[in-house]
């Protein structure tokens, strides 16, 4: 029974059974909708365009790490359509924060004006730091159904087939 | 074996009919949804209709609409385009292509089936 | 509707070249884009899909790159089977629209 299906899966009238919806590869995410027991026949997987990346699977692309804007680091790897960007060592003229507790954006470079005397990276110049920026990777699944409902991903597909 | 096999191409007099057959092998038809795209004499790709698996989705080229006909026997295997009103600028390589399941492109052609409209 | 350019309609190069067919949409297509070959006798085939990915059977040499409007098909070492027309293809937003096709020769 339809009802009896859940977030990503469909009603197969075939088998009468709930069958897992396709995922979608990695740098793709799904387009159109499938799961809660429906599953449109032309459900499928675009690529995610530029500047966002997806794991895979129920997944929708996710915009990259904004290294320099955001956190005022340095790019250590740019991201892809599969993976997202890596942040390097602060920027010039900013220090890390090393024992703050990380919120959801992980270590931010703070700016060497508001550092305490003595911040080993803005000692002397406002030369940049060689602490490793660790990575975040917040998780933040959306079903097909939501996203074909939402159109978060910015895809804007119409009546594609 | 051909995956995709076109037919039924010929001369046809302007304002004529003609049902072009796409007869599929080695897969499960029933799970792939199918195009149309043709090719006029020295020009390039042009896309004209689509029909989903299950024909519940059908979408045509403004170029077409209202004249030609996408269908699908599944229990045969085959595709179908029937055209009507046929015009010069209808002449062309017709191919059926297949897409791709879950993706959006053309992971198939057939050889394809030439139509010519003249009188 | 996407228009699909590709700006060189004939390009002639030696075997072993490394060759690129560029193409441009006009809307961002977000890596939606597709490249194929159709030999001489007319066979048509699939190369690359979704921009950078290679269609299982087709030669390494074959590479795509590419986002937003911009992209472009590179074949690495020309070999003389590569003589063909190649089309790109948006498959963002129907109507699907292709490349005016880019016709590769030997010199």
């Known amino acids: 029974e339809y009802s009896n299906c859940g977030e990503n899966e469909y009603y197969n009238q075939t088998t009468g059974l709930c069958q897992e919806c396709p995922p979608c590869g990695p740098g793709e995410e799904p387009y159109l909708s499938c799961g809660y027991g429906t599953k449109d026949e032309d459900y499928g997987c675009v690529p995610c365009p530029a500047e966002k990346f997806s794991k895979g699977g129920y997944q929708i692309c996710r915009r990259h790490k904004d290294c320099e804007g955001f956190f005022r680091a340095t790019v250590l790897t740019p991201g892809d359509m599969e993976n997202d960007a890596e942040c390097g060592p602060c920027l010039p003229g900013y220090y890390m924060l090393e024992n703050r507790p990380r919120n959801i954006y992980g270590m931010v470079c703070y700016s060497c004006l508001l550092a305490p005397p003595n911040t080993k990276e803005c000692v002397g110049a406002t030369s940049g730091a060689s602490a490793n920026f660790p990575g975040t990777s917040g998780s933040s699944t959306l079903s097909p159904f939501q996203h074909a409902h939402k159109e978060l991903s910015g895809q804007g597909h119409l009546a594609t087939a | 074996e051909v995956p995709l096999e076109e037919s039924g191409g010929g001369l046809v007099k302007p304002g004529g009919s003609r049902k072009l057959s796409c007869a599929a092998s080695g897969f499960t038809f029933s799970d792939y949804g199918m195009h149309w795209v043709r090719q006029a004499p020295e020009k390039g790709l042009e896309w004209v209709a689509y029909?989903?698996?299950?024909?519940?989705?059908?979408y045509y080229a403004d170029t077409v609409k209202g004249r030609f006909t996408i269908s699908r026997d599944n229990a045969k295997s085959t595709l179908f385009l029937q055209m009507t009103s046929l015009r010069s600028e209808d002449t062309a390589m017709y191919y059926c292509?297949?897409?791709?399941?879950?993706?959006?492109?053309?992971?198939?052609w057939g050889a394809g089936t030439t139509v010519t409209v003249s009188s | 509707d996407i228009q699909m350019t590709q700006s060189t309609s004939s390009l002639s190069a030696s075997l072993g070249d490394r060759v690129t067919i560029s193409c441009r949409a006009s809307?961002?297509?977000?890596?939606?884009l597709n490249w194929y070959q159709q030999r001489p006798d007319g066979t048509v085939k699939l190369l690359i899909y979704?921009?950078?990915r290679s269609q299982s059977g087709v030669p390494s040499r074959f590479s795509g790159s590419g986002s937003g409007t911009d992209y472009s098909l590179t074949i690495s070492n020309l070999e003389q089977e590569d003589v063909a027309t190649y089309f790109c293809h948006q498959g963002k937003t129907l109507p699907y629209t292709f490349g005016g096709g880019t016709k590769l020769e030997i010199k």
């Open positions: 979704y921009t950078s």
């Open positions: 029909i989903s698996s299950g024909s519940s989705a059908i």
């Open positions: 292509a297949r897409r791709e399941i879950l993706r959006y492109y053309f992971d198939v």
């Open positions: 809307q961002d297509i977000s890596n939606n």
